[in-house]
Interface confidence: low
Amino acid sequence: RLSSKSVNAQVTDINSKGLELRKTVTTVETQNLEGLHHDGQFCHKPCPPGERKARDCTVNGDEPDCVPCQEGKEYTDKAHFSSKCRRCRLCDEGHGLEVEINCTRTQNTKCRCKPNFFCNSTVCEHCDPCTKCEHGIIKECTLTSNTKCKEEGSRSN
């Protein structure tokens, strides 16, 4: 199972409370908006999704210089005032995960179970390997349920 430490290592939390759209990896809690206020000064406008502040705002009402996040490595999925992008999620093959949708500058990686793996909780921290049946299959493994096996000595249909 993914530990809090390993999940947090994949995420730079910039954050989100009250902002549009939705985010977060399972173990990351919602915090107050970071980067809105700096040394008593406000940025006039946030950076758009896919970008970050290049420098801190130094004059009240200053407009930030925004630069793109690193494609394939970082993203921000909402307007924000931070000088950091989020790190793209890694789909850990060792935990039975693979990439469904690659990370872009505006959307985090989407993971799914690898073939022959399943997860019967809808918020998955890892996927389990499908059971291999010795005496025949009643029901194939799916993304959300394990294989159902025939018991030894049960008659075939």
Epitope: V7, R22, T30, S121, V123
Partner: antibody, heavy 122, light 107 residues
């Protein structure tokens, strides 16, 4: 602005098949699960099942033998078929979108269709 | 299936009151609970996800808490538009299931 528009037959006889379609206008189609929910008159909400753009489905076990949810990505349509209907299937049927990915806890049926009233009566 | 039980089933309150609705799961669902508001003849509206995260555009007088089996929805100061029926929903495991609803009425 995302909108969900539903249509389908509103009056059915017992043993017939309920068929509803939900059209998605605007927004992303591929990054959501598309869900069907029903609400019998004067009662609570019942989750029927969901589908994503790849055709991966999850169904309520109590309806699984009778229900099929399918997707037409060329039209951004989601359809619901429920066979062998009885009076107990009389309800307001909603389609809705929900975002949930492996490793994420963010979820909410945040956009809903207008609902379709289905009555089963002989 | 996981059973979701809401209490109370109905509740009378006045504008300005603080109101708490509880939802109990028949087995642990971690934090994977959502709250919805439904007004007569309208589709439900998502208020809270992941037990305590506010959906975009929802007023801050709504808050959620809890984990495991016991959850609460609190409205800190009731407004006239808050009189409605509220539902909880678990999404820890399939099938997703809803509570039976709590009807919040004007006293």
């Amino acid at each position: 602005q995302v909108q969900l528009q539903q249509w389908g037959a509103g009056l059915l006889k017992p043993s017939e098949t309920l068929s509803l379609i939900c059209a998605v206008y605007g927004g992303s189609f591929s990054t959501y699960y598309w869900t069907w929910i029903r609400q019998p008159p004067g009662k609570g909400l019942e989750w029927i099942g969901e589908i994503n753009h790849r055709g991966t489905t999850n169904y309520s076990p109590s309806l699984k033998s009778r229900v099929t949810i399918s997707v037409d990505t060329s039209k951004n349509h989601i359809s619901l078929n429920l066979t062998s209907v009885t009076a107990a299937d009389t309800a307001l049927y909603y389609c809705a979108r929900g975002l949930l990915w492996i490793g994420e806890g963010d979820y909410g049926l945040d956009v809903w269709g207008q609902g379709t009233t289905v009555t089963v009566s002989s | 299936d996981i059973q979701m039980t809401q209490s109370p089933s109905s509740l009378s309150a006045s504008v300005g009151d603080r109101v708490t609705i509880t939802c109990r799961a028949s087995q642990g669902i971690r934090r994977w609970l959502a709250w919805y508001q439904q007004k007569p003849e309208k589709a439900p509206k998502s208020l809270i996800y992941a037990a305590s995260s506010l959906q975009s555009g929802v007023p801050s007088r709504f808050s959620g808490s809890g984990s495991g089996t016991d959850f609460t929805l609190t409205i800190s100061s009731l407004q006239p538009e808050d009189f409605a029926t509220y539902y909880c929903q678990q999404y820890n495991s399939y099938p997703y299931t809803f509570g039976q609803g709590t009807k919040l009425e004007i006293k």
